[in-house]
Every structure is written in structure tokens, then in C-alpha cells.
């Protein structure tokens, strides 16, 4: 019996078609990915195939303005109208708390949502109960097949699930669900979940019974043969992992934001046992035409994003300088706002010990790309945002070490004076340089913030210490110059849209005065 | 469609001026510091000017200081070259690019300046 | 900053493998970019920060190096390859490499 499994993970509001690097489309012959374009290839597959099955791996919440202002109802809209059959939650699906999970797409979808680790305590358990399962049952074909869900148990330290939800070890709470499938004749089991290929690699050693793990969170492009655009393979796919066991489990994963479509086909023997799987995902590109009905109703949909980006979310009281002649060579206040916003939006009170689990930011100032007038009435929209913040970033966390930290900070000002993007913005920070120094030996005073305080204060910067830093996606791939960062980051987990971060701190603040206020100084 | 469309080239005499123009669409010129390049014939590519994306920093080839001034106008998404006391390995085409970005980087056509009496 | 390519020329056939090499004058981190130039047009970023591949370009395309020496390599070159290749520089004021030029053999 052959079952062919199409999915996609970390999707992350990418409803319209993007460029090849998952930005707003600019050139439409050349652009990818969007619902409309993934409906279309979809369709196609199930004409052509008689058991076939749609999966999402979690992460459709943030990443765009699609996100900001429909909070999730239009991935339940869209999602129903492809027909989806399960979806995981990811730890993005909170980031709205728990309310903006149950609501509009807990309540609005059409197909089950699954996470086996998480568990409900106090009154939140019979309000969310049965809105999310920990597996479900489908029947494909003359078949039945049992998908399991999992959720990354790092959630409440990169979203905002509240107190009354428990994140269980994924491998833990996966094993006895597992158990019970199989006590209901269910031979065929798919893991579908979100905590990272390294997570999806080890349930597939170690979950007795799964046959299939279709995973999400790391952004993972796995491919066979030549990879048709610019993502480079981390494996094959599918992976192959042999489990505990002895048997042969295929572990797939398909890039991130909808620019390809997972496309694994598998074969079972009568007893429910993986024969052969093969595939790899698909390439959503201009090739695959839009659907006319998904695009129309897009559209549609578009109108309200558009009167959005002129709505005041705020207003500042102070000219907020963005100038390049500012943020590429000193302390400017707008990097002190996007910093504070970064790390106002990681505010995760997890642990008693802790005040909170990140206090540092660092922010190229090169990626700052306007100013914002006070003289406009102090009206700041999305727009404004859109434009000090153009590339469409995330604001991720990371784990460094303290040596590596002082590395970037070299760097931040091995070749000051040329106006160049790597100079960094801080929160969290107090860093003086002395440029009468050699490259390389600029720093001469790192402090950070302390996070294990009942009172924050500034300590020196310990080299061999591990420490919890906010940065754009940017810097965490190595930009600006920052292969440091690259190398040797420890953990990274992606965050929300950059432009949707800022905007929520100023709808939050009302009103803002952020000063130039001795992060960085010069001796 | 994101476009870069240079004009103002033409034939000039050593010692003359000629103002180039770029005109910019298709994105956010605001957003993005901007390039002169320039390509004698036959010859490789030699670059020229750089403006920051909001106009308040600005560098220079060796061979066109004080004679080249590169500026923009980001309300009417233009960018700008004026060329002064123009000298014979002046003459090249002359392109207007953006710098390497999130999104790679975006070139012109080009226009030709020839400078000879 | 000064850029050195070398060769200046080349000539290969389809199917080989080609290697271009650009030295700088003093160490440059990963600032380095690629560029191809075919007659007449625009030139068209291939590799930037010495190893990122740009979007669009064949993946047959790669970069490498750090410091100085820096290296952009061709897996197997195919028809549409045959044009000049330059390096640039952007640690400092930005410098192109004098040019490669590929041609068919």
C-alpha cells in the first residue's frame, strides 16, 4: 500500500508569493511559493494519486503583516480551503498566548491539531479541551493511518504560552500515544512535530512504532540530487535514521515560508511496515501557476493589510534617528528602541531564579534604514516601520559564548569610520571601545546585564560563560561580517518579524522618548 | 519589476561638465545606499562613487575626487552624478547599481559619456 | 586596497572544471563579491560575502576563501558561462579585480 505525504513547515504567514529569499515579491515571473501557488500543485498530486495525505509541521503564526493583522484567522481560512489533514502546533502558534491560538484557529479549523507534549492544567484544561488532540486517526484510502503531533518544549522561552500549559519531553509524552495506536490496530504512524531536526531525527530512534517523522523549526532543506534554487542540502531526502529497533524510519522536513512542497511517497507492507520511501520536496516556483479561485480570494483578503500600514500605532515624542551618519558610528536612539523592543518582546518570566531568561540585544546598525520625524505629529505607522526596517527580518535568540560575543564586538569596529553596517546597536550591553587601539583589540569594557538577578545590573562579560542574546536573523547567518556568530552560536531558534516586533512595542508603550544613554562609548 | 534607468550620457568635451541621472522603481530606493560604476572600452569595471541611503555619507574613487559629486533625491527616487572638468579616461559607460543587500543588488544598463574635442 | 585576478584569460570547454583566484593587498575578511559580465550588458552578482551564493544562480557556482586569497570555482561549465569574471572588494572603498575572461576552447 503506497501513501504519498505532502507537507510543509514554518510557513510563517507567506500567504502571497514571495522572491526566491522568502521577501515581499518583487518581480512576479521570478517569484515563489503563496497558497495559491501551493493549492495548485497540490491539487494536481491528488488527481494523479489515489492516498494522499497533507501535513503542516507548525509555524503558519508571524512572519509578515498577514499575521498582524489577521492574528491567525487567515491561516485557518487558507488552510481549510487547501484542505489540509493535520497540522502540529509549532511554539509560534503562541505567540499570541493561549486565547490567540484558541480562537482563531483552534476553534476555525477544519482538521485536527495535534501536539502529544503539551499538556493543559487548571481552567484552561476544559476550556481548550478537545481543541487540540495529541494524535488523530485518518482514514486514507482503505487504510487508516495515525499521525501523532509534537511541539518544541523550548515554547515558553520563545513564545507566550502562559503558566497553565505544560511542555512535556517530546520523546516521553510520545511513546505511550504511540502505544495506544497501536492498541487500536493502528499500524501505519506518521510523528508530525515541531522541535527541530535534531528532535526529529532522535524520535525516530527512539519512539517504538513511528514510521514516518515529518518535522519542522529548524528550517531543515533536506534534497536527492541537484537542489533546484539556492537552499543547500543538509542530507538527503528523505533522511534515513535506523531506530533502536532496527528499523529503517524516513525523517523529512521541507525548507520553511512555502517556497516548496514536501513530496515523500511511501510503501507499507500488510503488516504497516515502511518497504521504501522516496521523493523530495517540490519547488513552488513560476512554473506552477496560481490557482485563479485561492488567488481571488487573496486578494480579497489583501485590501485590509493595505488601509493597516497608514493606521497610527503609536507615537514618539522625540525625533527617533535612524540616520546613517548616527546608527554606523555611535550610539543612536533608534537602535536603542529596536533593542529595547527585542528584548521586550522575549519577556518570559519561566523561572523564579531569573528575572528573565535573555537580557542582551546586538542589532547592526546597518540594518536601520530610516529615521522617523516627531515633527509628523509624532504619528508612527507600519509603514514608517517598513521603511527603517525594509529587509524583512526576524529577531532571533541565540545562545553564545562570552568569547564569541567579544569576537562580534571586535568586529563591530575593526574598520569604524567608513560608514560601514557592522557597528552594532545594544540593549542589555555597556561596551567602550578605544580606537586609538589596533583592530582586533578595540574593546576595552563589555558589560552585560545580568538575567539570574533579582536586581539587574551590569557584570564584566565572562569569556567561557554561555549567555542568551536578541539578534536579527541577519547577523545569526553570518551577515555584515559576522562569521563568528555563525560558527560558533551554540542554539538558534527563530523569532517573530522584525517590523512586527517594533510595532507591537509601540502599540504597547502608547507613547515613546528613547535617549542616547551610554550603551557604547569611546575612551 | 525592479528598474534602474540611467540617461544624461552623451558626447562632452575635456574640461566640460555632464550630469548623469538614474531613475529608480520597482523597490524601496529609500532603503538602499547607491553606486557609480563605471566601464571604459574594452577595459574592466572601475568603481566610482557610493552614496549612503539616507545621503549623509559619501566616498569616492581617487581618480574622480573633487571633480565628481554623487547625490539623490530619495522623494523623487533618483540618484545622481555630476561630472566636471571631464577628461579623456573619463570616457566609459557608466552604471548606477545598489549596493549588495538582503536581495543581492540591482544594476542599470548603463549610459555612455565619451569625452573627447 | 588593490584586487589581483588571476588568470586574466582562460579557455576551457564545456563540461570542465574552472577555478579563478583574486588576491587582495591586504587581508579583507569576507568581503568579496563575484561578478559575471557578458558583451555589451550589466554585470550580474554571482557570490557575495566570499561564499554566499545569490539567489537565482546556479548552484555549479561556488565561492571560497578569507583574508586575501579567494577563489571562485565552476563545477562544470556550460555555454552560458563564457564571459569575463571580476572580483570587488568592499572592506574598503569598493575595487574590482582586473577581469577574467572565459572563452571557449
Known amino acids: 500500500w503506497e501513501l504519498t505525504i505532502l507537507h510543509t513547515n514554518d510557513v510563517h504567514s507567506r500567504l502571497e508569493q514571495t522572491s526566491e529569499d522568502s521577501s515581499k515579491c518583487v518581480n512576479a515571473s521570478r517569484c515563489m511559493g503563496g497558497v495559491a501557488r501551493l493549492f495548485t500543485k497540490v491539487q494536481q498530486i491528488r488527481r494523479a494519486e489515489p492516498n494522499v495525505l497533507l501535513l503542516d509541521a507548525g509555524d503558519q503564526y508571524q512572519g509578515t503583516i498577514w499575521f498582524t493583522v489577521y492574528k491567525g484567522a487567515e491561516v485557518a481560512h487558507f488552510m481549510n480551503a487547501l484542505r489540509y489533514d493535520a497540522m502540529a502546533l509549532g511554539n509560534h502558534e503562541f505567540d499570541n498566548g493561549v486565547e490567540g491560538l484558541i480562537e482563531p484557529l483552534l476553534k476555525e479549523a477544519k482538521f485536527p491539531i495535534l501536539s502529544a507534549n503539551i499538556k493543559a492544567k487548571g481552567p484552561l484544561a476544559s476550556q481548550i479541551s478537545g481543541l487540540y488532540l495529541p494524535y488523530k486517526v485518518l482514514p486514507v484510502g482503505d487504510e487508516v493511518v495515525g499521525i501523532v503531533g509534537y511541539t518544541s518544549k523550548e515554547t515558553p522561552f520563545l513564545s507566550n504560552p502562559g503558566t497553565n500549559l505544560v511542555f512535556e519531553d517530546e520523546i516521553t509524552a510520545l511513546q505511550p500515544e504511540v502505544d495506544k495506536l497501536k492498541t487500536l490496530n493502528v499500524n501505519k504512524i506518521i510523528a508530525l512535530g515541531h522541535s527541530g531536526f535534531e528532535m526529529d531525527k532522535l524520535i525516530a530512534q527512539k519512539v517504538r512504532g513511528v514510521d514516518v517523522v515529518v518535522g519542522g523549526h529548524s528550517n531543515t532543506f533536506l534534497y536527492t540530487g541537484n537542489p533546484p534554487s539556492k537552499e543547500v542540502p543538509a542530507g538527503k531526502y528523505p533522511f534515513i535514521v535506523t531506530s533502536d529497533d532496527g528499523r529503517k524510519v524516513p525523517v523529512v522536513q521541507a525548507y520553511a515560508f512555502g517556497k516548496y512542497l514536501g513530496y515523500l511517497k511511501i510503501e507499507f507492507d500488510e503488516r504497516g511496515n515502511v518497504i521504501s520511501s522516496h521523493g523530495n520536496p517540490i519547488l513552488l516556483n513560476s512554473s506552477i501557476p496560481e490557482d485563479p479561485s485561492i488567488k481571488a480570494d487573496i486578494n480579497k483578503w489583501r485590501i485590509k493589510l493595505d488601509n493597516y500600514s497608514t493606521q497610527e500605532l503609536g507615537k514618539t515624542i522625540v525625533y527617533l534617528d535612524g540616520s546613517s551618519q548616527s546608527c554606523r558610528f555611535r550610539e543612536c536612539n533608534m537602535g536603542n528602541l529596536i533593542c529595547d523592543a527585542m528584548i521586550n518582546n522575549n519577556l518570559r518570566h519561566t523561572d523564579e531564579m531569573f528575572w528573565n531568561h535573555v537580557s542582551m540585544c546586538i542589532l547592526n546598525g546597518g540594518g536601520i534604514r530610516s529615521p522617523i520625524d516627531e515633527r509628523n505629529n509624532g504619528t508612527i505607522t507600519w509603514e514608517n516601520l517598513a521603511a527603517v526596517l525594509p529587509f524583512g527580518g526576524t529577531f532571533d535568540l541565540v545562545q553564545l559564548k562570552g568569547s564569541t560575543l567579544k569576537k562580534a564586538f571586535e568586529h563591530s569596529v575593526h574598520r569604524y569610520g567608513q560608514s560601514t553596517g557592522e557597528f552594532l546597536q545594544v540593549g542589555g550591553i555597556h561596551v567602550v571601545y578605544d580606537l586609538s587601539r589596533k583592530p582586533g583589540d578595540r574593546v576595552v569594557k563589555l558589560d552585560v546585564l545580568c538575567t539570574k538577578c533579582r536586581v539587574p545590573s551590569y557584570d564584566p562579560l565572562k569569556m567561557d560563560e554561555v549567555y542568551k542574546v536578541i539578534l536579527p536573523n541577519f547577523l545569526a547567518n553570518g551577515g555584515d561580517g559576522f562569521q563568528m556568530i555563525k560558527d560558533e552560536l551554540l542554539r538558534h531558534d527563530s523569532g517573530d518579524q522584525d517590523i512586527n516586533v517594533v510595532s507591537t512595542y509601540i502599540s504597547k508603550m502608547k507613547v515613546i522618548y528613547p535617549a542616547v544613554e551610554g550603551r557604547i562609548k569611546f575612551s | 519589476e525592479v528598474q534602474l534607468v540611467e540617461s544624461g550620457g552623451g558626447l562632452v568635451q575635456p574640461g566640460g561638465s555632464l550630469r548623469l541621472s538614474c531613475a529608480a522603481s520597482?523597490?524601496?530606493?529609500?532603503?538602499?545606499?547607491m553606486h557609480w560604476v563605471r566601464q571604459a572600452p574594452g577595459k574592466g569595471l572601475e568603481w566610482v562613487a557610493v552614496m549612503s541611503y539616507d545621503g549623509s555619507n559619501k566616498y569616492y574613487a581617487d581618480s574622480v575626487k573633487g571633480r565628481f559629486t554623487i547625490s539623490r533625491d530619495n522623494s523623487k527616487n533618483a540618484l545622481y552624478l555630476q561630472m566636471n572638468s571631464l577628461r579623456a579616461e573619463d570616457t566609459a559607460v557608466y552604471y548606477c547599481?545598489?549596493?549588495?543587500?538582503?536581495?543581492?543588488?540591482?544594476w542599470g544598463q548603463g549610459t555612455l559619456v565619451t569625452v573627447s574635442s | 586596497i588593490q584586487m589581483t585576478q588571476s588568470p586574466s584569460s582562460l579557455s576551457a570547454s564545456v563540461g570542465d572544471r574552472v577555478t579563478i583566484t583574486c588576491r587582495a593587498s591586504?587581508?579583507?575578511?569576507?568581503?568579496l563579491a563575484w561578478y559575471q559580465q557578458k558583451p555589451g550588458k550589466a554585470p550580474k552578482l554571482l557570490i557575495y560575502a566570499a561564499s554566499t551564493l545569490q539567489s537565482g544562480v546556479p548552484s555549479r557556482f561556488s565561492g571560497s576563501g578569507s583574508g586575501t586569497d579567494f577563489t571562485l570555482t565552476i563545477s562544470s561549465l556550460q555555454p552560458e558561462d563564457f564571459a569575463t569574471y571580476y572580483c570587488q572588494q568592499s572592506y574598503s572603498t569598493p575595487h574590482f579585480g582586473q577581469g577574467t575572461r572565459l572563452e571557449i576552447k
Open positions: 547599481a545598489t549596493e549588495i543587500a538582503a536581495k543581492g543588488d540591482y
Open positions: 520597482g523597490f524601496t530606493f529609500s532603503s538602499y545606499d
Open positions: 591586504q587581508g579583507i575578511s569576507n568581503y
